[in-house]
Amino acid sequence: QRGPLPKPSLQALPSSLVPLEKPVTLRCQGPPGVDLYRLEKLSSSRYQDQAVLFIPAMKRHLAGRYRCSYQNGSLWSPPSDQLELVATGVFAKPSLSAQPGPAVSSGGDVTLQCQTRYGFDQFALYKEGDPAPYKNPERWYRASFPIITVTAAHSGTYRCYSFSSGDPYLWSAPSDPLELMVTGTSVTPSRLPTEPPSSVAEFSEATAELTVSFTNKVFTTETSRSITTSPKESDSPAGPARQYYTK
């Protein structure tokens, strides 16, 4: 083989956002004829020498950063891009609202507000039906997501998550859906809202070719920033949403 080995790709099927107790498969893909794959969880000493890791039921300690590489002869490839595996449903769901309201005129402005009872400092918003909606939600430190000059393409169903930067791979359950309606236009949205895959049946269908299960491999939790609060759905009082507006 001439030249450096290309780096492999690492993906999570059906998504890198995995509800607790739901299945997920991590799959490392290199060129044909690879001698050996290595899949590792960063910030831990755990790895496996297979291309596929099947997790039948997502657990908190399995959330974190993963990467993989492969060996051809005596050469090791560069590592894949890191994959961030997130466990969702760890904390109670936030609520998502639209200000001034969920019906907005084309050309107007609207702000989607992700409200949480807890002291979370990170928020994620996704629109169902967008490319990879469940895989790559928009994330930042603000609870508000301003949409300036609304168009028909903004119509659709939105959900949000909240989490702590102290443990960025453990997220809340998704909020209830918010339907944003753009009025004053006859243009049909290019994509229809679809529910992200979550059921075992859908998962099995999507990954039917992955027959090898490495459930005997134990991955330990990685070291991460400490969480300053440990919210539980049952014992945290409700309170006003944390606001990020300039006072």
Epitope: R65, D81, Q82, L83, E84, R117, Y118, G119, D121, Q122, A124, N136, P137, E138, R139, W140, Y141, R142, F145, P146, S165, G166, P168, T228, T229, G239, R242, Q243, Y244, Y245, T246, K247
Partner: antibody, heavy 115, light 111 residues
Framework: VMLVESGGGLVKPGGSLKLSCAAS????????MSWVRQTPEKRLEWVAT????????YYPDSVKGRFTISRDNAKNTLYLQMSSLRSADTAMYYC?????????WGQGTTLTVSS | DIVLTQSPASLAVSLGQRATISCRAS??????????MHWYQQKPGQPPKLLFY???NLESGIPARFSGSGSRTDFTLTINPVETDDVATYYC?????????FGGGTKLEIK
């Protein structure tokens, strides 16, 4: 984690300039990113923030309407387009990974606005 | 905007002694019992480096000689004992309310 800024230089008042920040060592598309500047008097000022996928941006009043933050996740690169520059914009500009606080910073690139 | 006032502007401490830096906010930076105040260290010619996030959470790799405390409007960064490597300027920053703001900095020198 590595962040490398470029594009600084000397610009006349009213001029424009675009800064870039190349990111590596982390999943760039999963993180909000920001620009923070440091004046010659060593004061730190937050300049702009963009959400992980690039759909949402936020600016302080001091730069709103003049600066535009953007990102190319395929290239792992953050940008800051600056226009209508003023002498008060003279500073070292840092890109930083953003958690509300800034846990990783680049080495910075210097902008001087002077006639 | 929330104004963060650091004091003193500079201080000189003997090696092995305690250095205490204060940051006072013009209004509370707390929410849900969490203080959205953060601390950075900046050495000459380098970018700022995160020391603490949310008042008292020590960033990975930072020595335990550093401690952060406080709530609402009054926050303290303590270095005990001070070492030569600690010579730097220290900044506080709040993220409870936009726009996010920084303190003016405290320059630490060795006596």
């Amino acid at each position: 984690v590595m962040l490398v800024e470029s594009g600084g230089g000397l610009v006349k008042p009213g001029g424009s300039l675009k800064l870039s920040c190349a990111a590596s060592g982390f999943t760039f598309s999963s993180y909000a990113m920001s620009w923070v500047r440091q004046t010659p008097e060593k004061r730190l000022e937050w300049v702009a923030t963009i959400s992980s996928g690039g759909s949402y941006t936020y600016y302080p009043d001091s730069v709103k309407g003049r600066f535009t933050i953007s990102r190319d996740n395929a290239k792992n690169t953050l940008y800051l387009q600056m226009s209508s520059l003023r002498s008060a914009d003279t500073a070292m500009y840092y890109c930083a990974r953003d958690y509300g606080y800034f846990d990783y910073w680049g080495q910075g690139t210097t902008l001087t606005v002077s006639s | 905007d929330i104004v963060l006032t650091q004091s003193p502007a500079s201080l000189a401490v003997s090696l092995g002694q305690r250095a205490t830096i204060s940051c006072r906010a013009s209004e509370s930076v707390d929410n849900y019992g969490i203080s959205f105040m953060h601390w950075y260290q900046q050495k000459p010619g380098q970018p700022p480096k995160l020391l603490f996030y949310r008042a008292s959470n020590l960033e990975s790799g930072i020595p335990a000689r550093f401690s952060g405390s406080g709530s609402r409007t009054d926050f303290t960064l303590t270095i005990n004992p001070v070492e030569t490597d600690d010579v730097a300027t220290y900044y506080c920053q709040q993220s409870n309310t936009d726009p996010r703001t920084f303190g003016g900095g405290t320059k630490l020198e060795i006596k």
